[in-house]
């Protein structure tokens, strides 16, 4: 059965937008006016995952690209990457765990916790134009809260 997906954009809690930075990286920066068209549109897919009260398992693909955010160990550290997949097979209901994020939503603020690495979150830096990364701290300097805007399908 096809997985259900919605198109959206994400901004961090400082209102920085996410844009492509090279073929396999995202960065966060403030955009205005026509530059807003640069922001990446995600296809958020509602996938199978471990049962939990306040967490909704999702996969985050780049709309109309065969790229998904995934979490892997690099040099023994949980790392966020954009991974290329076979578009004939993705998205699917049972995504591999590295592609799955637990969406935690409180008062329209969203966090994305790695299913593969609990307590590691999609994060941005306070600084402008820095890569989006997987961070192991919440409530510190780095930003783990996002807002979501729907995009017409």
């Amino acid at each position: 059965a096809p997985v259900r997906s919605l198109n959206c954009t994400l901004r961090d809690s400082q209102q920085k937008s996410l844009v492509m930075s090279g073929p396999y990286e995202l960065k966060a920066l403030h955009l205005q006016g026509q530059d807003m068209e640069q922001q990446v549109v995600f296809s958020m897919s509602f996938v199978q995952g471990e049962e939990s009260n306040d967490k909704i398992p999702v996969a985050l693909g780049l709309k109309e690209k065969n790229l998904y955010l995934s979490c892997v160990l690099k040099d023994d550290k949980p790392t966020l990457q954009l991974e290329s997949v076979d578009p004939k097979n993705y998205p699917k209901k049972k995504m591999e765990k590295r592609f799955v994020f637990n969406k935690i939503e409180i008062n329209n603020k969203l966090e994305f916790e790695s299913a593969q690495f609990p307590n590691w979150y999609i994060s941005t830096s306070q600084a402008e134009n820095m890569p989006v990364f997987l961070g192991g701290t919440k409530g510190g300097q780095d930003i783990t809260d996002f807002t979501m805007q729907f995009v017409s399908s």
Partner: antibody, heavy 120, light 107 residues
Framework: QVQLVQSGAEVKKPGSSVKVSCKAS????????IEWVRQAPGQGLEWMGE????????NYNEKFKGRVTITADKSTSTAYMELSSLRSEDTAVYYC?????????????WGQGTLVTVSS | DIQMTQSPSSLSASVGDRVTITCKFS??????LSWFQQKPGKAPKSLIY???RLVDGVPSRFSGSGSGTDFTLTISSLQPEDFATYYC?????????FGGGTKVEIK
Amino acid sequence: QVQLVQSGAEVKKPGSSVKVSCKASGYTFDRYWIEWVRQAPGQGLEWMGEILPGSGTINYNEKFKGRVTITADKSTSTAYMELSSLRSEDTAVYYCARMYYDYDQGFDNWGQGTLVTVSS
Amino acid sequence: DIQMTQSPSSLSASVGDRVTITCKFSQDIDRFLSWFQQKPGKAPKSLIYRVKRLVDGVPSRFSGSGSGTDFTLTISSLQPEDFATYYCVQYDEFPYTFGGGTKVEIK
């Protein structure tokens, strides 16, 4: 508090169309699917389709495709379900309900229902 | 389409009885299953979502369980206001489908 208020009962002739409205209040209209479900007299519930006003995404039950049109007006927080080529077996109570965009809490609030009677 | 069977279609019970209603599906569904209560002439009322989570304000005598293809609604001690028709619904896959209903009547 959350409310879904539907338009009043309708009597329609076979072959005609009916448009039922569902006005939402007490929540962020954009972020919830509006579901349309019908119930024929003495029968069970049947899902017709849904719309997410924030994105304009619409999903229909194939059984009704081509006969049903679901729309939403964000400016008035109102969703609409239009059913065309009516026949006697379309006589039913039509309900709207809402569901969060991520499907988490199911059909958590319902309208009061709109009785549509199709009779010559 | 996902086929489903809700059973029993009706049952007679007394106040204080434990009542169990089941829904069986033709294939695995994920967590997207809810239970409703409907009284004559009224809109359905949500009781349980995501298989086992109780809607705010619903008494704890209602509970849901199950996984895969088999799901259950249990009323631990039937109260006079619980006499109604109960439906399950899967919203895991299009088209969303409702069970045929279980009418709980007074014995």
